[in-house]
């Protein structure tokens, strides 16, 4: 069966939106008015992985682009990147682990934990206009909580 996907946007708990700031980079900043259409639309695919009531494995692709968020070691540090894939083979139910995030819902907020690197989360900075990154701390200065907005196909 084909993998189930939905289109959505994400905002951090400070209401910063995510935009493409480079060919393989996202950043977070406050958008308003017509600028809102600049925000990235994700195709969130529900993939194979360890699942529980509040933890669902997903892959985060960029809608209509052959790009997926992935987690890799760079200079011995878990790092978030946008990775180009062959569109003939993606999305698929059994995604490689670097593409998988555990979507965790707590108090109507979402966290995205790397399946490859447990306790590392998709994060944004408090500061405006900074890259989206993989952070190893929760509840500190950096933001790991998001809300999801559904987008029609």
């Amino acid at each position: 069966a084909p993998v189930r996907s939905l289109n959505c946007t994400l905002r951090d708990s400070q209401q910063k939106s995510l935009v493409m700031s480079g060919p393989y980079e996202l950043k977070a900043l406050h958008l308003q008015g017509q600028d809102m259409e600049q925000q990235v639309v994700f195709s969130m695919s529900f993939v194979q992985g360890e699942e529980s009531n509040d933890k669902i494995p997903v892959a985060l692709g960029l809608k209509e682009k052959n790009l997926y968020l992935s987690c890799v070691l760079k200079d011995d540090k878990p790092t978030l990147q946008l990775e180009s894939v062959d569109p003939k083979n993606y999305p698929k139910k059994k995604m490689e682990k670097r593409f998988v995030f555990n979507k965790i819902e707590i108090n109507n907020k979402l966290e995205f934990e790397s399946a490859q690197f447990p306790n590392w989360y998709i994060s944004t900075s408090q500061a405006e206009n900074m890259p989206v990154f993989l952070g190893g701390t929760k509840g500190g200065q950096d933001i790991t909580d998001f809300t999801m907005q559904f987008v029609s196909s």
Partner: antibody, heavy 120, light 110 residues
Framework: EVQLVESGGGLVQPGGSLRLSCAVS????????MTWVRQAPGKGLEWIGY???????SYASWAKGRFTISKDSSKNTVYLQINSLRAEDTAVYFC??????????????WGPGTLVTVSS | DIQMTQSPSSVSASVGDRVTIKCQAS??????LAWYQQKPGKRPKLLIY???TLASGVPSRFSGSGSGTDFTLTISSLQPEDFATYYC????????????FGGGTKVEIK
């Protein structure tokens, strides 16, 4: 109101360099990626490259090396530096704002263009 | 490396005619296509984005269709102000690309 105005074109000798400017107003270069496109006399549109909102640049494969796109967000200006100019670089050079609508890159609006003529 | 091929390169038509311009991508670009109109000595103007969405202020006689690799721009009833050159543009990838634009189609008076 969103506006873009190119400047810096003119007559240049082969082998020379030129820096074109694109002054923008009505939006932020921290939010929007910008692109440069050129059009040789009587020819079609030719994409040169992007300066992304984060500051990195992407280029058409033929433009890598001699062309450099940069920006100064505090001056609301985007630049195109062209080195080792050749006769075939003679063209109208346009800048345009890149709208990412559902991740799809669309060029709107465009500046009026600036003419670069390379001749001895 | 996505390449965009536009056809025909020119078309002669009369006022009131239905005109169809085709654009083909060398690989799948989903709905990532825009169409532009350019008149001599002027800047290009966005007509259609995301393959079929009309840009603000564009008359409804213009329409776009297609997805994947094959796209079409249709002018249902050609008006005098529509004589111009039309370009398609892929908006999906900027990596290892020669040109995001098709070669253009000139719509001339018959």
């Amino acid at each position: 109101e969103v506006q873009l105005v190119e400047s810096g074109g003119g007559l240049v000798q082969p082998g020379g360099s030129l820096r074109l400017s694109c002054a923008v107003s009505g939006f932020s270069l921290d939010v929007y990626t910008m692109t440069w496109v050129r059009q040789a006399p009587g020819k079609g549109l030719e994409w040169i490259g992007y300066i992304w909102s984060g500051g990195s640049a992407s280029y058409a494969s033929w433009a890598k090396g001699r062309f450099t796109i940069s920006k100064d967000s505090s001056k609301n200006t985007v630049y195109l530096q062209i080195n080792s100019l050749r006769a075939e670089d003679t063209a109208v050079y346009f800048c345009a704002r890149v709208k990412m609508i559902s991740n799809i890159e669309t060029f709107d609006p465009w500046g009026p263009g600036t003419l670069v003529t390379v001749s001895s | 490396d996505i390449q965009m091929t536009q056809s025909p390169s020119s078309v002669s038509a009369s006022v009131g005619d239905r005109v169809t311009i085709k654009c083909q991508a060398s690989e799948r670009i989903y709905s990532g296509l825009a169409w532009y109109q350019q008149k001599p000595g002027k800047r290009p103007k966005l007509l259609i984005y995301r393959a079929s969405t009309l840009a603000s202020g564009v008359p409804s006689r213009f329409s776009g269709s297609g997805s994947g690799t094959d796209f079409t721009l249709t002018i249902s009833s050609l008006q005098p102000e529509d004589f111009a050159t039309y370009y398609c543009q892929q908006g999906v990838s900027s990596s290892d690309i020669d040109n995001v634009f098709g070669g253009g189609t000139k719509v001339e008076i018959k």
